[in-house]
């Protein structure tokens, strides 16, 4: 004959544990039902009656099977530099992530506690490491034969155009200027692999809360006005 299925509440066999979605109530010394996600224990079980569950109130939640007396409070509303990527429901907490052009400077278990604007590299500097969801942009000087004339959180240093006749030579913050003949971008001159000396060591402007572009969190960025900066899977 098959073993009889026990209904909650029931006393467990000595040395055995309660089944899945059940918990052992120390007071009643019985295996009792847990409450499903989105609910909490309104009345705990006794030797003769099972747990009584009730739905979570607005702005509260439980994510797991539980026997908590009160649901957890959802986090506060997302701030202006954040986007709500998961709404507060009876079964899940609100998740706030940083909006484009910002990164998470202080994370919490899920989502972000504090967002900060991505650093912008000033002219003569390019994005050596892009910003990700959790890390700021790293700016470094342009190498010889390359330049960046923008203040940007996404632009890398791009090669100078090659002129048949140079009107003004390029430098770290300015492209070469050619005389009337058409330029090419086939190859930047010189083969040394070093940054241009820069008079000031400050590598970026102060972050501002109005990023000029959506961030690229890719390692390298598009050249010139070609395709828009891409997003990254981050780190």
């Amino acid at each position: 004959l098959p073993a009889q299925v026990a209904f909650t509440p029931y006393a467990p066999e000595p040395g055995s544990t309660c089944r899945l979605r059940e918990y052992y109530d120390q007071t009643a010394q019985m295996c009792c039902s847990k409450c499903s996600p989105g609910q909490h224990a309104k009345v705990f079980c006794t030797k003769t009656s099972d747990t009584v569950c009730d739905s979570c109130e607005d702005s509260t939640y439980t994510q797991l099977w539980n026997w908590v007396p009160e649901c957890l409070s959802c986090g506060s509303r997302c701030s202006s530099d954040q986007v709500e990527t998961q709404a507060c429901t009876r079964e899940q907490n609100r998740i706030c992530t940083c909006r484009p052009g910002w990164y998470c400077a202080l994370s919490k278990q899920e989502g972000c506690r504090l967002c900060a604007p991505l650093r912008k590299c000033r002219p003569g500097f390019g994005v050596a490491r892009p910003g990700t969801e959790t890390s700021d942009v790293v700016c470094k000087p342009c190498a010889p034969g390359t330049f960046s004339n923008t203040t940007s959180s996404t632009d890398i240093c791009r090669p100078h155009q090659i002129c048949n006749v140079v009107a003004i030579p390029g430098n770290a913050s300015m492209d070469a200027v050619c005389t009337s003949t058409s330029p090419t971008r086939s190859m930047a001159p010189g083969a040394v692999h070093l940054p241009q000396p820069v008079s000031t060591r400050s590598q970026h402007t102060q972050p501002t809360p109005e990023p000029s572009t959506a961030p690229s969190t890719s390692f390298l960025l598009p050249m010139g006005p070609s395709p828009p900066a891409e997003g990254s899977t981050g780190d």
């Epitope: 590299c121 500097f125 390019g126 994005v127 050596a128 490491r129 892009p130 790293v138 700016c139 470094k140 000087p141 342009c142 190498a143 390359t146 960046s148 890398i156 240093c157 692999h193 070093l194 940054p195 000396p197 060591r201 590598q203 890719s218 390692f219 390298l220 960025l221 598009p222 050249m223 395709p227 891409e230 990254s232 899977t233 981050g234 780190d235």
Partner: antibody
Framework: EVQLVQSGAEVKKPGATVKISCKVS????????LHWVQQAPGKGLEWMGW????????KYGQKFQSRVTITADTSTDTAYMELSSLRSEDTAVYYC???????????WGQGTLVTVSS | DIVMTQSPATLSVSPGERATLSCKAS??????VDWYQQKPGQSPRVLIY???IRYTGIPARFSGSGSGTEFTLTISILQSEDFAVYFC?????????FGQGTKLEIK
């Protein structure tokens, strides 16, 4: 002209720790991010991590995270890579590589051979 | 991790001919791919960055193309000094990963 000059070859026993240096000359080390890349004999390249010497911020590859420490001394323009709990499969050439505002590894050291053998 | 697969493993071409090397990413990496050349006993050196930007001082016979998951390095007229191993590298997401390399040898 910039140069990345690495320390000499090392022979280590399993379980030991190795520390390799990478001296940047010609320009300030803070003008770069410094990456470390492993190349096992006859194998491809494997990224280990990087350091920004300006603020000592680091990023490590998950495979090496528990055993590698990358540091930099701005007073001597030198970066270091320390790999602990060495095993035979760590026998490889280790490269440092510099990353400027182009966003690529545009200058490399000559490599340091580390041999792990009992 | 993003896997970069290079093909062929070995490519035999005569000097003066064209060589086409392929690199495929296991997921979309946009245009975040670099190509490196390595000769025996030497360190790698960058040829192409951001999929198609030729690095400072690299001859015009080297060109890169592609985006998303498929990338190509083309050497238009092979010189004797071009016979080496070529690696592609993605930098879209961490960890940064390299292809296993294509050995370009003289036919």
């Amino acid at each position: 002209e910039v140069q990345l000059v690495q320390s000499g070859a090392e022979v280590k026993k399993p379980g030991a720790t190795v520390k390799i240096s990478c001296k940047v000359s010609g320009y300030s080390i803070t003008d770069y991010l410094l990456h470390w890349v492993q190349q096992a004999p006859g194998k491809g390249l494997e990224w280990m991590g990087w350091i920004d010497p300006e603020d000592a911020k680091t990023k490590y590859g998950q495979k090496f995270q528990s055993r590698v420490t990358i540091t930099a001394d701005t007073s001597t323009d030198t970066a270091y890579m320390e790999l602990s709990s060495l095993r035979s499969e760590d026998t490889a050439v280790y490269y440092c590589a510099a990353n400027s505002g182009t966003g690529t590894m545009d200058a490399w050291g000559q490599g340091t051979l580390v041999t792990v053998s009992s | 991790d993003i896997v970069m697969t290079q093909s062929p493993a070995t490519l035999s071409v005569s000097p003066g001919e064209r060589a086409t090397l392929s690199c495929k990413a296991s997921q979309n990496v946009g245009s975040n791919v670099d190509w490196y050349q390595q000769k025996p006993g030497q360190s790698p050196r960058v040829l192409i960055y951001k999929a198609s930007i030729r690095y400072t001082g690299i001859p015009a016979r080297f060109s890169g193309s592609g985006s998303g998951t498929e990338f190509t390095l083309t050497i238009s007229i092979l010189q004797s000094e071009d016979f080496a191993v070529y690696f592609c590298m993605q930098s879209k997401s961490y960890p940064i990963t390299f292809g296993q390399g294509t050995k370009l040898e003289i036919k």
